[in-house]
């Protein structure tokens, strides 16, 4: 009795689904009552399928709702373990253990990759030095090196810094910044570089036309304009008030001939 594995190494992507397989000999029809299949990963129990029944009580909590034995494959002599929504913690050495008359087991290694695909970028300007700060941020795994290049794809000299932190899903959150002297429409590239082929991801950053070359002065213009408007409103309000006071004095000096004329004057004044 021999268990075989079509592949003993799987490289899978974070968040994807994977199916790892162990083959065992089945002659004619499968006798479920004689079959035992276990899948384990290090010290975690994933699948316990004994005499046709799966026991989920002993399944490790990290695989709950994510791991299943593909029962329809058993009659073909294939103990296939499917894991959905692959996590970084799923990387490791798996063991399929099968007893069907005789018994045997094999090991399968799983590696998990998370490409730095979604690169967030930002450009800002230092008003004091007119230097541009270019920032690229992305999440992935394992560690990546961030390489900055210009439009000719040549390395860029400038002050750079990198910060790395962990996300909730244990991915690496890598932020790289570069300070350079640049002019409008200059093109820069940040590349999250990993040694494996096909694992490099690049973002293009273009220095904007008028990223308001003097943003603080621009803000001053608005403040000044606002102040002038406010001053004009205050002055016109004061003038109106003074005009009202002058009219009131005139009415008092002339005297009032009858009630109706006084009422008329009041009405006119209110409408002014």
């Amino acid at each position: 009795f021999t268990v075989t594995v079509p592949k003993d190494l799987y490289v899978v992507e974070y968040g994807s689904n994977m199916t790892i397989e162990c083959k065992f000999p089945v002659e004619k029809q499968l006798d479920l009552a004689a079959l035992i299949v276990y899948w384990e990963m290090e010290d975690k129990n994933i699948i316990q399928f004994v005499h046709g029944e799966e026991d989920l009580k002993v399944q490790h909590s990290s695989y709950r709702q994510r791991a299943r034995l593909l029962k329809d494959q058993l009659s073909l002599g294939n103990a296939a373990l499917q894991i959905t929504d692959v996590k970084l913690q799923d990387a490791g050495v798996y063991r399929c253990m099968i007893s069907y008359g005789g018994a045997d087991y094999k090991r399968i290694t799983v590696k998990v990759n998370a490409p730095y695909r979604k690169i967030n970028q930002r450009i800002s300007v230092d008003p004091a030095t007119s230097e541009h700060e270019l920032i690229c941020q992305a999440e992935g795994y394992p560690e990546a090196e961030v390489i900055w290049t210009n439009s000719d794809h040549q390395p860029v000299s400038g002050k750079r810094s990198v910060t790395t932190s962990r996300t909730e899903g244990m991915l690496l959150n890598v932020t790289s910044s570069l300070r350079v002297n640049a002019t409008a429409n200059d093109v820069f590239y940040c590349t999250f570089w990993r040694s494996q082929p096909g694992q490099n991801h690049t973002a293009e950053l273009i220095i904007p036309e008028l990223p308001a070359t003097h943003p603080p002065q621009n803000r001053t213009h608005w403040v000044l304009l606002g102040s002038i408007l406010l001053f004009l409103i205050v002055v016109s309000t004061v003038l109106l008030f003074l005009r009202k006071q002058v009219r009131m004095l005139d009415v008092e000096k002339c005297g009032v001939e009858d009630t109706s004329s006084k009422n008329r004057n009041d009405t006119q004044f209110e409408e002014t």
Epitope: F1, E40, N45, Q48, Y100, G101, G102, A103
Partner: antibody, heavy 118, light 113 residues
Amino acid sequence: EVQLQESGPSLVKPSQTLSLTCSVTGDSITSGYWNWIRKFPGNKLEYMGYISYTGSTYYNPSLKSRFSITRDTSKNQYFLQLNSVTTEDTATYYCASYEGWLLPFAYWGQGTLVTVSA
Amino acid sequence: DIVMSQSPSSLAVSVGEKVPLSCKSSQSLLYSSNQKSSLAWYQQKPGQSPKLLIYWASTRESGVPDRFTGSGSGTDFTLTISSVKAEDLAVYYCQQYYGYPFTFGSGTKLEIK
């Protein structure tokens, strides 16, 4: 050195549940495979099943669904529970361990004789 | 289940004698991964628990005297005690760990004349 020690009642009434404890020293039950084996009068040895380091279990189909093994990793103990016992279950019960899935029993307890009688 | 048959069921021998104990399995115990047979021999002395003597049909467990030798492959196995000592009085069991459930032979009781 790994040592295993069985404990539990020596007399059980028919139809009752037999419960035995195996206390392990010198090794952690979170590694290896931890088994129960019994020897009937007349020297016949029967393999009952195991609980593994992951907590997975295997039970000999001959015991149908009467038998279960559980563990308490904090106390480094594992347990046998055999329901609805009959006089046929009178035997010396051994706990034993092996290191890998397909390896022989390297360590044995000294055994405890359990008699099922009214 | 794999059936293990042992013969003879009991044997009386004199000290210093060479003794072969036989064990047969109902199917081959040859394990493909290492091309060895998944068979063990145990010794159980009166009032004691079984003790592992031989595994993989011929590998002697550490601390076991070299007068105990295991041989055979596939379905036929032999435990040979080259020169019996009085302390070898015991029941000897063979056991397969080729497939679950593991099974034992009925044992051979060795008595000293």
